[in-house]
């Protein structure tokens, strides 16, 4: 009598994650009587994939009706394949007995699973940094197979070079992850800038996946301060302005001090945006010169985005202002930028 053969015609099968995989197996003879079982892997640690007689295998179905008389086709279909299903599958014939005895195994079919990378997620620094500082952005993508992948970083369309990228694990695995860190030098013009992480993989139809982050989430642009005096008004009042320019984000508190005493505090809100994404704000303080005997030291104190306050002081020379109306004598600006 001819020796029974278990034929697995494909050495290897490749499928995309989410698809179904058909693993073919035929036997050359109906004799001896006994079941066919499918296993993943060989040896004592092998995993039972399909057994017609018993067990619950929700994702595995027989291609032919195995209960049909004279059936010699024991091919199976595995639905909704994931990278975790990769491995070598063996179709094994048993001789009926108590217990059944393994008789012959097919040569095995290696199932390879191709899986797309997940959409890259870009995260920036936890705290804002000021211009001329370098911040790090991280990009992560998971679940892809095979391992080969390319990742590029761009800032406003220009590729970044200060990049460190790792694909894990280093050895063979059912799927892989990539993590990349890019170091970006911030400039005052970066409020509207964007970094893009671009991932290319064989499973993507020519178009890389992209993750983005806005530098507006990472940057702080400290304000410039300028205090100036307008000409004296007819009612002996001097109008002093504090111009706070080119700052980001908008979170800003301005306090006027007269001779060291708090005169007024204001919070910036609903400011119009400059073209570069920064903000400007102007605050006015009216000083009644006739109410003062000595020169008045005015300080514009700005606290921006929780940072230490920045001061700009200005002296109004009372002696320079005759008390009669109509005087238009200029006040002296003795101010400098001071930090508390």
């Amino acid at each position: 009598e001819e020796e029974l053969q278990v034929i697995q015609p494909e050495k290897s099968v490749s499928v995309a994650a989410g698809d179904s995989a058909t693993l073919n197996c035929t036997v050359s003879s109906l004799i001896p009587v006994g079941p066919i079982q499918w296993f993943r892997g060989a040896g004592p640690g092998r995993e039972l994939i399909y057994n017609l007689k018993e067990g619950h295998f929700p994702r595995v179905t027989a291609v032919s009706d195995p209960t049909k008389r004279n059936n010699m086709d024991f091919s199976i279909r595995i639905s909704n394949i994931t990278p975790a299903d990769a491995g070598t599958y063996y179709c094994v014939k048993f001789r009926k007995g108590s217990p059944d005895v393994e008789l012959k195994s097919g040569a095995g079919t290696e199932l390879s699973v191709r899986a797309k990378p997940s959409a890259p997620v870009v995260s920036g620094p936890a705290v804002r940094a000021t211009a001329e500082h370098t911040v790090s952005f991280t990009c992560e993508s998971h679940g892809f197979s095979p391992r080969d992948i390319t990742l590029k970083w761009f800032k406003n369309g220009n590729e970044l070079s200060d990049v460190q990228t790792n694909v894990d694990p280093a050895g063979k695995s059912v799927s892989y992850s990539i993590r990349s860190t890019a170091r970006v030098l911030l400039t005052r013009r970066d409020v509207h800038s964007q970094v893009i992480c671009e991932v290319a993989h064989v499973t993507l139809q020519g178009d890389p996946l992209r993750g983005t982050a806005n530098l507006s989430e990472a940057i702080r642009v400290p304000p410039f301060l300028e205090v100036t005096q307008q000409s004296m008004r007819a009612d002996n009042q001097v109008n002093v302005t504090c111009q706070v320019t080119k700052f980001y984000p908008q979170r800003l508190q301005l306090t006027w001090l007269e001779n060291g005493n708090v005169s007024r505090t204001e919070m910036a809100s609903a400011l119009p945006e400059n073209k570069d994404g920064t903000y400007n704000w102007t605050s006015w303080l009216l000083v009644n010169v006739s109410a003062h005997r000595d020169d008045v030291k005015l300080t514009c104190q700005v606290e921006h985005d929780g940072q230490p306050a920045v001061n700009k002081s200005f002296s109004v020379k009372v002696s320079a202002h005759p008390k009669e109306q109509g005087s238009n004598t200029a006040a002296e600006n003795t101010g400098t930028n001071e930090r508390n």
Partner: antibody
């Protein structure tokens, strides 16, 4: 699933020519498509691809001589200025469902002859 | 650019022979290699992708192996319909470009 090239003809050096690849049975917005050529008695040569979203990529030798574009059912190859060495059969092909590393469906080809 | 060197450029064989064609890449392409069969006046037909995976409908006498830089296409028992030209084609995952070998013509001895 079918691809058919058209537009091949006798053309004069220095003149432009546009080839088309008409597809049926699948959507061009789901697959990378490629153009290839084969000079008489020679091997296959890669020209370029167009991604599922419509971004073209070219072989390094193309140097702006060819332009690949597509509509919903056709992919075009515009040859800006024909040269005698462009005489070849031009094939369009679609990448496989598992990835962009191989082409599983090919058109029958269209012949371009460049001669004065 | 990656160069693909196919050998031999031609071979003569008889029906039933075992035929081996090799393809060497100038740098590693991992397993991104496909094999095509082309007959005169016809379009190429895919045989093998990812170095070793048999495309659906292709007879099992065709097999592929290799990874990195060295690849092999084997026809275990040559049939009359197998007389054709065979091409290897690489895809480089970094440059995302394709390169073909120069072809191997399999003729009847």
């Amino acid at each position: 699933v079918q691809l058919v090239e058209s537009g091949g003809r006798l053309g004069q050096p220095g003149t432009p020519l546009t080839l088309s690849c008409t597809v049926s049975g699948f959507s061009l917005s789901s697959y990378v498509m490629g153009w290839f050529r084969q000079a008489p008695g020679k091997g296959l040569e890669y020209i370029g691809i167009i991604s599922s979203s419509g971004s073209p990529y070219y072989a390094s030798w193309v140097n702006g001589r060819f332009t690949i574009s597509k509509t919903s059912t056709t992919m075009d190859l515009k040859m800006n200025s024909l040269r005698s060495e462009d005489t070849a059969t031009y094939f369009c092909a679609r990448v496989g469902p598992l990835g962009v590393d191989y082409f599983n469906i090919w058109g029958p080809g269209t012949l371009v002859t460049v001669s004065s | 650019d990656i160069q693909m060197t196919q050998s031999p450029s031609s071979l003569s064989a008889s029906v039933g022979d075992r035929v081996t064609i090799t393809c060497r890449a100038s740098q590693s392409i991992n397993s991104y290699l496909a094999w095509y069969q082309q007959k005169p006046g016809k379009a190429p037909k895919l045989l093998i992708y990812s170095a070793s995976f048999l495309y659906s409908g292709v007879p099992s006498r065709f097999s592929g192996s290799g990874s990195g830089t060295d690849f092999t296409l084997t026809i275990s028992s040559l049939q009359p319909e197998d007389f054709a030209t065979y091409y290897c084609q690489s895809w480089h995952y970094i440059s995302r470009s394709y390169t073909f070998g120069q072809g191997t013509k399999v003729e009847i001895k």
